[in-house]
């Protein structure tokens, strides 16, 4: 038995309004009803959770009212979008993959999606 | 799946020692860094130690009173810990978590990356 795998892009840059999206894909070894999926940034020897959301197969993901993160699921394919970033967000952003129920649990992590986030040049004033 | 299920635990004296051992079933240990966590009453669990197949990392407040060690053959992880303290009071968890490239001596303890999870055991430090 290995950790589950998962599999999310090497690199994404953020749009000009601060907004990355990625797939995170797992390989579920059984038939899992209910998956928590969260997104995890480590940058400068420090881990915080991005956000969390939890799922039942089938439905919509779920994430709190006031999350900078959305999403959609498809199968084992979770869509993730995160907004809001700015470019001292840079980082590493890790799909942490949990399969809930029904037992037994599973656990897999991906490589991580280094995102780059360059904030946006203001325009300079216009004479006209 | 992968299960874990710790022993050792137990009373002992301020300055004493205690072996906590962890049995890892289900996998061997290389795929995955197994820690060592506590939760005292009323507090947050937070890391304690933990070790991969070539390294090892630990909490400040145990550097050098602690010592992680992994048995391959058994499957097996220890938490030696010495000159125990009455904050060292605490439910003992071993976890395991995926082994990762990007973990970092200062990420590979890092709660967020488990899921595995033993039961507990209690440790108390009498003064």
């Known amino acids: 038995c290995k950790a589950m795998h998962v599999a999310q892009p090497a690199v994404v840059l953020a749009s000009s309004r601060g907004i990355a999206s990625f797939v995170c894909e797992y390989a579920s070894p059984g038939k899992a009803t209910e998956v928590r999926v969260t997104v995890l940034r480590q940058a400068d020897s420090q881990v915080t959770e991005v956000c969390a959301a939890t799922y039942m197969m089938g439905n919509e993901l779920t994430f709190l009212d006031d999350s900078i993160c959305t999403g959609t699921s498809s199968g084992n394919q979770v869509n993730l979008t995160i907004q809001g970033l700015r470019a001292m967000d840079t980082g590493l952003y890790i799909c942490k993959v949990e399969l809930m129920y029904p037992p037994p649990y599973y656990l897999g992590i991906g490589n991580g999606t280094q995102i780059y986030v360059i904030d946006p040049e203001p325009c300079p004033d216009s004479d006209f | 799946q992968v299960q874990l299920v710790e022993s050792g635990g137990g009373l002992a004296q301020s300055g004493g020692s205690l072996r906590l051992s962890c049995a890892v079933s289900?996998?061997?240990?290389?795929?995955?860094?197994i820690g060592w966590f506590r939760q005292a009453p009323g507090k947050e669990r937070e890391t304690v130690s933990c070790i991969n197949r070539n390294r090892a990392s630990y909490a400040d407040g145990v550097k050098g009173r602690f010592t992680i060690s992994r048995d391959t053959a058994k499957n097996m992880v220890y938490l030696q810990m010495n000159s125990l303290k009455p904050e060292d009071t605490a439910v003992y968890y071993c976890?395991?978590?995926?082994?990762?490239?990007?973990?970092?001596?200062?990420?590979?303890?890092?709660?967020?990356?488990?899921?595995?999870w033993a039961q507990g055991t209690l440790v108390t430090v009498s003064s």
């Open positions: 976890a395991a978590s995926p082994d990762k490239a990007f973990y970092t001596d200062q990420t590979m303890c890092n709660i967020h990356y488990y899921g595995y």
């Open positions: 289900g996998s061997t240990l290389d795929p995955f860094v």
